[in-house]
Structure formats: structure tokens, C-alpha cells
Interface confidence: low
């Protein structure tokens, strides 16, 4: 998906007011345990199709993040402010609802959720070039 | 626990360039903006510029683009800023703050900065 | 820039009663405010962001209201040791200001 006409304006306040809090609550009870951030973004589009990636696309060692509340906002806000962005996603929806496992919060899936937060500061940040 | 600690009051005549420090503790350093505000004495609170510390990428305030350079160094999880050339005017107190969504969580005590002759 | 004007300048009160600070920003920034607490000699300390959401430790007495342009800040049956200078601040877009600050003296 084409991340280039979404209203950044609207994901960006959807992701401060809830998106944020969310990913900070999935990451609470880390024992300042620090992940390094391998994981980065270039512009606007580029970020959110990394978002995407990391939090919907299953990786070893973490299948789980689909379900969380982080993922549902972000798949929501996604919907609402990308045109077209539900229609690729159905055939991508039915797919992970078949391999939907049971919830666990794995090492592995704290670290890509500590990438998540890291895309999604890049995303935000004021610095970052507008393509 | 979260900490921010910066370097202590400098004294400086005008004119000769000062670095003040912040080193960051008990976070992940590279995951937070770090932020620099400056404040003169009984006045208020003026944004300076911040440093991404995961790339060095920093954004400065026009107001001070040729007054202060922001660096960081991340293997001693401590940013820097400079100020060039400082003047009468440049005597504050200095506060670096960290930030991840643009409000600031966590403040350096404050760096209290005299220019004098 | 976006312009934040905060009202009053200064403000006396006594302990218990009921004070609100105004910020006005000279364009919409949504929700993105924050307000602080600053004492005398000391850093400011975050007490609503968002506009609305009280950080960690912030006493139930605060609350913080509106969008868009206008925001309060409020203290509800003030304690003595709520006395000193409130900012707020925005977080729209760079540069990011600060209100000119309200000074809350005891009566």
C-alpha cells in the first residue's frame, strides 16, 4: 500500500492521544531493559509502512501483536485516514485471523514493539521531511 | 529511575564559546528527543532546539541557529550544547529535557550560565 | 510561530481556594499542550499533557481542559505547596513555545 495521501496530521494526533499510551502500557514491567533501535524511517509514507510491517506481519519469535490495542488503533487509524487502505487489507485481515494464536508476550515481541515506538517517534517528529 | 544530569554554573567572558553536558540515565538514550530551553533570570521559558541522539539529526530554534550546536555522544549517553560567542544576553539557566511525543517528562536540574568581563 | 498567551500574569489566592490559569494559542494545535510547574531555583515539573491527561504523581486537584486554541489549567482547593510560576506550552509544531508564565503568589 501506497502510504503517500494519508492525512499524517490525523494519524499523528491519533497516535498521541492513544496509540502512544498504549505501546507504553504493552511495554510496562521492562525492567529498563534497552533495545537498540535497528529499525528506521525516512519520511512520512516510509514510516508508516514500516509501522505496518512490524505490527501486522508476523515474525519469528512474535505472532501475536495483531490482537493487541496498539494494533487495533493503529489498524483503525490506518483505515480512516488512508484511502483505500481497508481494501488491501481484508485479504491480508482473513489470512492472520486463520493463524491467530494464543497471546503471549515474548522477549522478541518487546523489542519489535520497542522498534514500533521508535518508527513512530519518527514519524512524529517535527524534523522529519514531508515527502 | 530516570535521570538527567547536568554539568555545573560556568562563568565565561564574552565572547569564549562554553559546552554545557546532560548525561542521561536509567532510559533508553536513543529512544527520547533531547531537548534544550533556555531561561534568564526571572523571565520564561524559551524553546532553544532538540537532538535526535539516534542519528545526531538536529533541529534548532531560528532564534538561535547561530548561537547553539547540539551534539550528542551515545556511548557515554550524554548530549551537549554549545554556545558560540556568548554575549550579556546569553547569562540563563540552561535545562536539557527529554521528550518523546513533545512534552517534556524529565528536566536536567539546570545549568546556570554567567558571561562576564 | 504559534504565539501562546497565558492569563493571568500573576495571580494571588489562598490555600483551599480554586484558581484557573488560561493559555491561548495563536492557531488551532489541537490537544497538544502541556502545562508545568516551576518553583523557585528549580526545573519545571509536567503536570497535564495532551491537554488533559495528568502525568504520573500529579495530585487529583489539577485538571487540565480544551482544544483547538483555548486551554485551563486548573487547581482545585489549593496547598501550599502549589504556590510558584505555571507555563504552559505547546507541542504542535516547531518551534515550540511557551506561554509567558503565570506567577501564583500566596495572599
Known amino acids: 500500500y501506497d502510504f503517500t495521501n494519508c492525512d499524517f496530521e490525523k494519524i499523528k494526533a491519533a497516535y498521541l492521544s492513544t496509540i502512544s499510551k498504549d505501546l507504553i502500557t504493552y511495554m510496562s514491567g521492562t525492567k529498563s531493559t534497552e533495545f537498540n533501535n535497528t529499525v528506521s524511517c525516512s519520511n512520512r509514507p516510509h514510516c508508516l509502512t514500516e509501522i505496518q510491517s512490524l505490527t501486522f506481519n508476523p515474525t519469528a519469535g512474535c505472532a501475536s501483536l495483531a490482537k493487541e490495542m496498539f494494533a487495533m488503533k493503529t489498524k483503525a487509524a490506518l483505515a480512516i485516514w488512508c484511502p483505500g487502505y481497508s481494501e488491501t487489507q481484508i485479504n491480508a485481515t482473513q489470512a492472520m485471523k486463520k493463524r491467530r494464536k494464543r497471546k503471549v508476550t515474548t522477549n522478541k515481541c518487546l523489542e519489535q514493539v520497542s522498534q514500533l515506538q521508535g518508527l513512530w517517534r519518527r514519524f512524529n517528529r517535527p524534523l522529519l521531511k514531508q515527502q | 529511575q530516570v535521570q538527567l544530569q547536568q554539568s555545573g554554573p560556568q562563568l565565561v567572558r564574552p565572547g569564549a564559546s562554553v559546552k554545557i553536558s546532560c548525561k542521561a540515565s536509567?532510559?533508553?538514550?536513543?529512544?527520547?528527543?533531547m531537548h534544550w530551553v533556555k531561561q534568564r533570570p526571572g523571565q520564561g521559558l524559551e524553546w532553544i532546539g532538540l537532538i535526535d541522539p539516534s542519528d545526531g539529526e538536529a533541529g534548532l530554534n531560528q532564534n538561535f541557529k547561530d548561537k547553539a550546536t547540539l551534539t550528542v555522544d551515545i556511548s557515554s549517553r550524554t548530549a551537549y550544547m554549545q554556545i558560540s560567542s556568548p554575549t550579556s544576553e546569553d547569562s540563563a539557566v540552561y535545562f536539557c529535557a527529554r521528550s518523546l511525543d513533545g512534552y517534556y517528562d524529565y528536566w536536567g536540574q539546570g545549568t546556570t550560565l554567567t558571561v562576564s568581563s | 510561530d504559534i504565539q501562546m498567551t497565558q492569563s493571568p500574569a500573576s495571580l494571588s489566592a489562598s490555600v483551599g481556594e480554586t484558581v484557573t490559569i488560561t493559555c491561548r494559542a495563536s492557531?488551532?494545535?489541537?490537544?497538544?499542550l502541556a502545562w508545568y510547574q516551576q518553583k523557585q531555583g528549580k526545573s519545571p515539573q509536567l503536570l497535564v499533557y495532551n491537554a488533559k491527561t495528568l502525568a504520573e504523581g500529579v495530585p487529583s486537584r489539577f485538571s487540565g481542559s480544551g482544544s483547538g486554541t483555548q486551554f485551563s489549567l486548573k487547581i482545585n482547593s489549593l496547598q501550599p505547596e502549589d504556590f510558584g510560576s505555571y507555563y504552559c506550552q505547546h507541542f504542535w509544531s516547531t518551534p515550540w513555545t511557551f506561554g509567558g508564565g503565570t506567577k501564583l503568589e500566596l495572599k
Open positions: 536509567g532510559y533508553s538514550f536513543t529512544t527520547y528527543w
Open positions: 492557531e488551532d494545535i489541537y490537544s497538544y
